[in-house]
Amino acid sequence: EEELQVIQPEKSVSVAAGESATLNCTATSLIPVGPIQWFRGVGPGRELIYHQKEGHFPRVTPVSDPTKRNNMDFSIRISNITPADAGTYYCVKFRKGSPDVELKSGAGTELSVRAKPSAPVVSGPAVRATAEHTVSFTCESHGFSPRDITLKWFKNGNELSDFQTNVDPAGKSVSYSIRSTARVVLTRRDVHSQVICEVAHVTLQGDPLRGTANLSEAIRVPPFLEFTQQSMRADNQVNVTCQVMKFYPQRLQLTWLENGNVSRTEMASALPENKDGTYNWTSWLLVNVSAHRDDVKLTCQVEHDGQPAVNKSFSVKVSAHPKEQGSNTAAENTGTNERNIYGGSG
């Protein structure tokens, strides 16, 4: 009588998550009488996957009719595979006894599970930064297998090169996660820009997954301030405007001060957007020159997006008021400005 052999023809089987895996096993002899058991792993900690004799294995079914003894086929089908099912499976023949005696094991079939990566999630910096600064964006995707994966970064369709990527864990695992951090230099024109994280994996059939983040969430474009003064009107009133230009986001508060005293405070709202995504806002103040004996120092104070206030000051001369004064002739810009705020009055 030939010696019993347990044959597992496939060294490895790869299955997509959610599908069924067929693990093949045949025996070369019907004897001795005794059950076949399937295990994952080896040694005392091995996990029983299927037992011909007993137990409840709802996801495991024998491929062949178990009541037909002469087929010698002990293959099983495991349904609804998840990454947690990955591992090496062994078909083991036992001789009937008390206890059953292990006779022969197959060589094992490694089951690898192809699991799709989750949709990449891109997160930006917690606080906004201004142009010329570098900000970091992080892209994360989880639950994929096998470990091989490709991640690319794009800004407005142009591939980025300044990024670092890690795939965890480093050793063998049922599934993996990827985390990548890209460094992006902001420009004033980036309000409408977008960064894209693109993940390619064998399970995606060449159709990569993308996660996006808008640079509008990460950028702050501080405003330019400009003063203009219209000609003196017949009623001795001068219309002074403070133009707040090219700022983002819209959150902005403007305060007028006359000789250091608050005259009016306004909040920007529902402003039209410039083509580049920034905003402009013009605020005006009527100054009654005849009510002042001395020159009037006007200050336009702008608080943008919670940043320290920026002031621009302007003096309206009250000595000698020509009736049809041209623009700026009775005014002197005395402001000192920081942060790219233009000096001058018009």
Epitope: L30, I31, E54, R69, K96, S98, P99
Partner: antibody, heavy 118, light 107 residues
Amino acid sequence: EVQLVESGGGLVQPGGSLRLSCAASGFTLSSYDMHWVRQATGKGLEWVSAIGTAGDTYYTGSVKGRFTISRENAKNSLYLQMNSLRAADTAVYYCVRGGVWDDAFDIWGQGTMVTVSS
Amino acid sequence: DIQMTQSPSSLSASVGDRVTITCRASQDINNYLAWFQQKPGKAPKSLIYTASSLHSGVPSKFSGSGSGTDFTLTISSLQPEDFATYYCQQYVSYPYTFGQGTKLEIK
């Protein structure tokens, strides 16, 4: 339909011989361990003999050397050759199929009566 | 040889009753234990194998349990057709041996 039909029983004198047959249908007899079980009138069940798929044979102590189990694959039949019969061998003899992988009895024939009496 | 002892030898019960028959092996038989039902003048019928697995076509009112040396057969709700003699059998090693039987009678 899976079926076992015994034949060959009858009245025989002590020391005599008898050959029981079991015709199998609906399955290949050679793929299964096959058994003979007997039951004396008003008594319990007693396992008598078995033949494995490899032709290996087994007997209960009281029939060893007197009974021989065999099979004929071409006829899909099982046999029990009974020699040196004794009164204690009087019983209904059942042909039984052993289960797929553990030899648990699953299919029984209707039985054939053997009477050993002078 | 492995001895199989059934208890009780006979049992009276009524229709609708739940009954339990026990079987003890003289040594560990793992769970290679079968139960059979036999009615007068008929061949035995296979009910349970490997202590708790039902043969196909056997109603679920029959259940088996146990491992090692102690085993039970339970019939959850007796019907008239269930009154018969029940046998346990070990088939872990030759010679296979049966219990002496439990006769279940109608009260």
